[in-house]
Amino acid sequence: FPMFKRGRCLCIGPGVKAVKVADIEKASIMYPSNNCDKIEVIITLKENKGQRCLNPKSKQARLIIKKVERKNF
């Protein structure tokens, strides 16, 4: 679950509510910063199927964020 900085929000519009766990290659979390004032959860899909932004308020996103925070703190 890597975290990285960027120059602006990457996610736009409504995020998906959930992604099948079996389809997830990795999850990246970007916390609010000067560049983007919201938390973003970006899922990279397996088999080069691209990336999706998760709705940060969704149950799945909250679980991922919790998992990362347990790991890092």
């Epitope: 929000c9 990457l10 996610c11 519009g13 409504p14 995020g15 691209g50 990336q51």
Partner: nanobody
Framework: EVQLVESGGGLVQAGGSLRLSCAAS????????IGWFRQAPGKEREGVSW????????YYADSVKGRFTISSDNAKNTVYLQMNSLKPEDTAVYYC???????????????????WGQGTQVTVSS
């Protein structure tokens, strides 16, 4: 049943205007963004305009900036594409599509869209 129904296409002279509508049903409107795409004969489908009804953010392809305006009426679950100063090269079948989970880099990626309309023909004569 999810449905996206486009209307408003037709034949117009160069320099004229049309307003396309995309009426959505069968899903929660705020959970999706709507993109307008077009496909001219023998060409690939290309993104034209995009709107998130949840926060009102909009994007336009360079080829239509300043001429086309996208808007949404959340009460009617409908997205509109106002097309002004039309050119012959705008001739195409216009489709609306609904999707979610976009990154700034993927709004024109057709695979990101879950639902598509049947299209409406726009013909601009010179």
């Amino acid at each position: 049943e999810v449905q996206l129904v486009e209307s408003g296409g037709g034949l117009v002279q160069a320099g004229g205007s049309l307003r396309l509508s995309c009426a959505a049903s069968g899903f929660t409107f705020d959970d999706y963004a709507i993109g307008w795409f077009r496909q001219a004969p023998g060409k690939e489908r290309e993104g034209v305009s995009w709107i998130s009804s949840s926060d009102g953010s909009t994007y336009y392809a360079d080829s239509v900036k300043g001429r086309f305006t996208i808007s949404s009426d959340n009460a009617k679950n409908t997205v509109y594409l106002q097309m002004n100063s039309l050119k012959p090269e705008d001739t195409a079948v216009y489709y609306c599509a609904a999707g979610a989970g976009f990154l700034i880099t993927t709004i024109w990626t057709t695979q990101m869209y879950d639902y598509w309309g049947q299209g409406t023909q726009v013909t601009v004569s010179s």
